[in-house]
């Protein structure tokens, strides 16, 4: 970054000399260089109790460059600040410090964040969920005859991620005990999955399915086929007022 | 609270001078270059000249070269622009400004125009 | 001196539109590059610098991009209180130079 940095001779003329190192335009033996060739940007660098000047292809961190008509000078940023555009506005502070409008503050003001990526103070973003989406299918086992009772779920997207600070996401999936008319499965429904439930025995300590309230009970009890159209509209209703059972994903 | 504070304007001939101020207040002054920024009514915006921190060197734009000085005094706060051989063209207001790459504090402005 | 053309001159703008001004350089300045408003009768105020960067104090609808030779304003939604002129200038190196304006009014 700072490639030519020009230096004074040793065993040179304390006052003003032309015959200097580096990218020194003019230099002296105290002071190092006064003034730098074209495009270099001039600075004083603290050493010790002294200042000297020394004379840089760019600014070097923690200073700013001005081209001015005769110079190209290097100015001091804040003290906390590693990159500025001026002395007002820092761009990127030094460790331990968050940038905000400009400045760098220990602590992010409140209502927001320190991004410890960026080392910058941003906005607090809270989750943001869609709609929920249709219930599926009432099933059980993977499909949908041949029982009583099953279960339907729906899920919902995020469509905003929360920050740091931000409110958690609630739950995106939900499902719930459902109850259907009793029909028998087609051939071929059946298929693979029927004759694989019959072998298998359950589990020792497996539960017995929880029975839904009777409220889903009573929607289900079987009806005349012409008024099977109106049963389903109300037990989707009932059911909807049901709080879901179980929750199965929550971000 | 920054504040600059321009005074000095007023109607003048063509050839005559006249002589601008500025009081600043609220940063260090003595850290700033400071500068003149004009607008002509219904233009646009022109730096004429900023003269750094220390008044050490001073610069200008192209119209008002030779003509315009820029001064200052740290210890009284104050910006001066001195113009002589004043144009109809110079009919402006006049801003006072710190200047550090950006024009980041600026007067509520002082009008000078300039005819016969 | 480094050249600036700003454009449009003059638009016309209803609350809540989006508008963009637009601002081209005559040589490669990085990100060295500033925004001002002007309302009449005002000075101007400093509203983006380093070509991107918000003031303390101006609302969250303005934003600013670019880089070398091409910059861009933008306001997401304009209020009422954006109707006026606005300037761009290159902080790159002296003479300071500033587009022509752009006065945004209402439609």
């Known amino acids: 970054q700072n490639a030519s940095r020009g230096r004074r001779q040793r065993r040179m003329h304390p006052n003003v000399s032309q015959g200097c190192q580096g990218g020194c335009a003019t230099c002296s033996d105290y002071n190092g260089c006064l003034s730098c060739k074209p495009r270099l940007f001039f600075a004083l660098e603290r050493i010790g109790m002294k200042q000297i000047g020394v004379c840089l292809s760019s600014c070097p961190s923690g200073y700013y460059g001005t081209r001015y008509p005769d110079i190209n000078k290097c100015t001091k940023c804040k003290a906390d600040c590693d990159t500025c555009f001026n002395k007002n506005f820092c761009t990127k502070c030094k460790s331990g410090f968050y940038l905000h409008l400009g400045k760098c503050l220990d602590n992010c003001p409140e209502g927001l964040e320190a991004n410890n990526h960026t080392m910058e103070c941003v906005s607090i973003v809270h989750c943001e969920v869609s709609e929920w989406n249709p219930w599926s299918p009432c099933t059980k086992k993977g499909k949908t005859c041949g029982f009583k009772r099953g279960t339907e779920t729906r899920v919902r997207e995020i469509i905003q991620h929360p920050s740091a600070k931000g409110n958690l996401c609630p739950p995106t999936n939900e499902t719930r005990k459902c109850t259907v008319q009793r029909k028998k499965c087609q051939k071929g429904e059946r298929g693979k999955k029927g004759r694989e439930r019959k072998r298998k025995k359950p589990n020792k300590g497996e539960s017995k399915e929880a029975i839904p309230d009777s409220k889903s009970l009573e929607s289900s009890k079987e009806i005349p086929e012409q008024r099977e159209n109106k049963q389903q509209q109300k037990k989707r209703k009932v059911q909807d007022k049901q709080k879901s059972v179980s929750v199965s994903t929550v971000h | 609270e920054v504040q600059l504070v321009e005074s000095g304007g007023g109607v003048v001939q063509p050839g005559r001078s006249l002589r601008l101020s500025c009081a600043a207040s609220g940063f260090t002054f003595s850290d700033y270059d400071m500068a003149w920024v004009r607008q002509a009514p219904g233009k646009g915006l022109e730096w004429v000249a900023t003269i750094i921190y220390d008044g050490s060197r001073a610069y200008f734009g192209d119209s008002v070269r030779g003509r315009f000085t820029v001064s200052r005094d740290n210890s009284k706060n104050t910006l001066y622009l001195q113009m002589n051989s004043l144009r109809a063209e110079d009919t402006a207001v006049y801003y006072c400004?710190?200047?550090?790459?950006?024009?980041?504090?600026w007067g509520q402005g002082t009008m000078v125009t300039v005819s016969s | 001196d480094i050249q600036m053309t700003q454009s449009p001159s003059s638009l016309s703008a209803s609350v809540g539109d989006r508008v963009t001004i637009t601002c081209l350089v005559s040589e490669d300045i990085s990100n060295d590059f500033v925004w001002y408003q002007q309302k009449p009768g005002k000075a101007p105020k400093l509203l983006i610098y380093a070509a991107s960067r918000l003031q303390d104090g101006v609302p969250s609808r303005f934003s600013g991009s670019g880089s070398g030779t091409d910059f861009t304003l933008t306001i997401s939604s304009l209020q009422p209180e954006d109707f006026a002129t606005y300037f761009c200038q290159q902080s790159y190196k002296y003479p300071p130079t500033f587009g022509q304006g752009t006065k945004l009014e209402i439609k």
């Open positions: 400004t710190a200047h550090d790459r950006s024009f980041d504090y």
